[in-house]
Interface confidence: low
């Protein structure tokens, strides 16, 4: 089940052992997957926070993590708590981890279970996270992970070179093997030079590349953003001026559950990822994506709840020069702001149209069954399927999505609620923009 | 007091099948995740089987196909099915479950049962 509000630091759930015992096993990706630098920086910090560990006190934890005095309760096994556990922070307790969302393999003392990875783009699942096992994740096919980079997984060759054979397929965890014909030796697997290449596919580390393709490519890309540049400038900068105007940059999800370092900064939404990409295309500074709100914002007025009742059914002509964004009211982080709201939704959604709505939003039949087998109760099915959204999506799961996809259901009488109640629960309020006044 | 009882174990010859119960009494609201662990003499407490409230279940790969785990959430007891038992098999069983009580909000205690002996010999 969902242990809501609980946003301590994953970090914090290692502590001093009591004695030696089993490692907790991180990942259960097949072959090796992590850096060996960082394999330095997490050791330092792993004896910091053993070092620390003492300072963490009861302010550290949510409430809902605070373990009430309580008689004859079950102790640990000597200090240490079963695979799918973890330790309670008075050490007098097994708290079980959430099926789907962290686990822990071993006998452990940890503070907090381990978050489950979540297989990256490019990668396939071949089993999912459970208590006690982390998820195991696998290069997809005609790609493999090789262990000078274990961080991605890289496009197989489609050939060997010159004078080599093929003696090896291209796996998940290797790229194809070829040999000398003469001698039978390996190839060392660097990229040939490119006369020796056979066969490539365009676009693999082998592929050809002469002078005049790059002046073509070059061309081409001028063309590209020449056009990209006018376009924005003509049919698209009404959409993104709001963002730019003062929309809080997307962050966010659960804190002890979104892994930050897989997001990209200022994802709220496509189209402003779009345009960020045509109009800034080499690497971006995080502090140059995040959209930052000025402080006297020209042209758009912050409305209370109560002013913008009547704004709620605005005539079309209004809605195609303005786009009103519903933002937190007390600047706070849009997702997490949106997931206080969830245990609502249920009220305010019809029970018929919960799955497809989810669906929608991106969550896979399985997520959808995890959710009900984890839900407290019937009530409670909406609200852990909302959670899955977002753990899954992080960044991306903002309230103009959800309201999008209810529209598209056509539940136009759903979002009309739950529009109105974040409104009148004073956690959202409109950011209202004027395209027209605010481009001059 | 929350109470976890098995029973259901016994002396079995190999290839024979056993059914373990475990029923939790005493006060509580909700229970999560039940599953049974086995400790043979000498050796850690192994997880064999897990089971949500919604019936997702997970094995250890040494029971695949041959224990099945089940629970009736109306009696609040879960049941071990074990067939085509094997000397390697004998342990002692504890039934765990992971109870949530009001004291606790979300967080869930982790009780044990006192162990029911499980001996697969010819």
């Known amino acids: 089940m969902e242990q809501r509000g609980q946003n301590a630091p994953a970090a914090s759930g290692a502590r001093k052992r009591h004695g030696p015992g089993p490692r907790e096993a991180r990942g259960a990706r097949p072959g090796p997957r992590v850096p060996k630098t960082l394999v330095l920086v997490v050791a330092a910090v792993l004896l910091l926070v053993s070092a620390e560990s003492a300072l963490i006190t009861q302010q550290d934890l949510a409430p809902q993590q605070r373990a009430a005095p309580q008689q004859k309760r079950s102790s640990p096994s000597e200090g240490l708590c079963p695979p799918g556990h973890h330790i309670s922070e008075d050490g007098r307790d097994c708290i079980s981890c959430k099926y789907g969302q962290d686990y822990s393999t071993h006998w452990n003392d940890l503070l907090f279970c381990l978050r489950c990875t979540r297989c990256d783009s490019g990668e396939v699942e071949l089993s999912p996270c459970t208590t006690t096992r982390n998820t195991v994740c696998q290069c997809e096919e005609g790609t493999f992970r090789e262990e000078d980079s274990p961080e991605m997984c890289r496009k197989c060759r489609t050939g060997c070179p010159r004078g080599m054979v093929k003696v090896g397929d291209c796996t998940p965890w290797s790229d194809i093997e070829c040999v000398h014909k003469e001698s039978g030796t390996k190839h060392s697997g660097e990229v040939p030079a490119v006369e020796e290449t056979v066969t490539s596919s365009p676009g693999t580390p082998a592929s050809p590349c002469s002078l005049s393709g790059i002046i073509i490519g070059v061309t081409v890309a001028a063309v590209v953003l020449i056009v990209a540049v006018f376009v924005c400038k003509s049919l698209l900068w009404k959409k993104v001026l709001p963002y730019l105007k003062g929309i809080c940059s997307g962050g966010g999800g659960d804190p002890e559950r979104v892994d930050r370092s897989s997001q990209r900064p200022g994802a709220e939404d496509n189209v402003l990822n779009e345009i960020v990409s045509i109009l800034q295309p080499t690497q971006v500074p995080e502090q140059e994506m995040e959209v930052q709100e000025p402080a006297e914002p020209t042209g758009v007025n912050m409305l209370s709840p109560g002013e913008s009742e009547h704004l709620l059914e605005p005539a079309e002509a209004e809605r195609s020069q303005r786009r009103r964004l519903l933002v937190p009211a007390n600047e706070g982080d849009p997702t997490e702001t949106l997931r206080q709201c969830f245990d609502d939704f249920a009220d305010l959604v019809p029970f018929d149209s919960w799955e497809p709505l989810m669906r929608k939003l991106g969550l896979m039949d399985n997520e959808i069954k995890v959710a009900k087998a984890e839900a407290a109760g019937h009530r409670d099915t909406l609200y852990t399927m909302l959670i899955k959204w977002v753990n899954k999506t992080g960044r991306d799961a903002s309230v103009h999505t959800l309201l999008d996809a209810l529209e598209t259901l056509g539940e136009r009488l759903a979002k009309q609620k739950i529009e109105d109640h974040l409104l009148s629960s004073g956690k959202f309020m409109y950011l209202e923009g004027n395209a027209d006044s605010a481009m001059s | 007091e929350v109470q976890l009882l098995e029973s259901g174990g016994g002396l079995v010859q190999p290839g024979g099948s056993l059914r373990l119960s475990c029923a939790a009494s005493?006060?509580?609201?909700?229970?999560?995740?039940m599953g049974w662990y086995r400790q043979a003499p000498g050796k850690q407490r192994d997880l064999v089987a897990q089971?949500?409230?919604?019936?997702?279940?997970d094995y250890a790969d040494s029971v695949k196909g041959r224990f099945t785990i089940s629970r009736d959430n109306s009696k609040n007891t879960l049941y071990l099915q074990m067939n085509s038992l094997r000397p390697e098999d004998t342990a002692v069983y504890y039934c765990?479950?992971?109870?949530?009580?009001?004291?606790?909000?979300?967080?869930?205690?982790?009780?044990w049962g006192q162990g029911t002996l499980v001996t697969v010999s010819s």
């Open positions: 765990n479950a992971e109870i949530l009580k009001r004291a606790y909000i979300d967080v869930y205690v982790n009780y």
């Open positions: 005493g006060t509580f609201d909700k229970i999560n995740n």
């Open positions: 089971i949500t409230p919604g019936g997702i279940t």
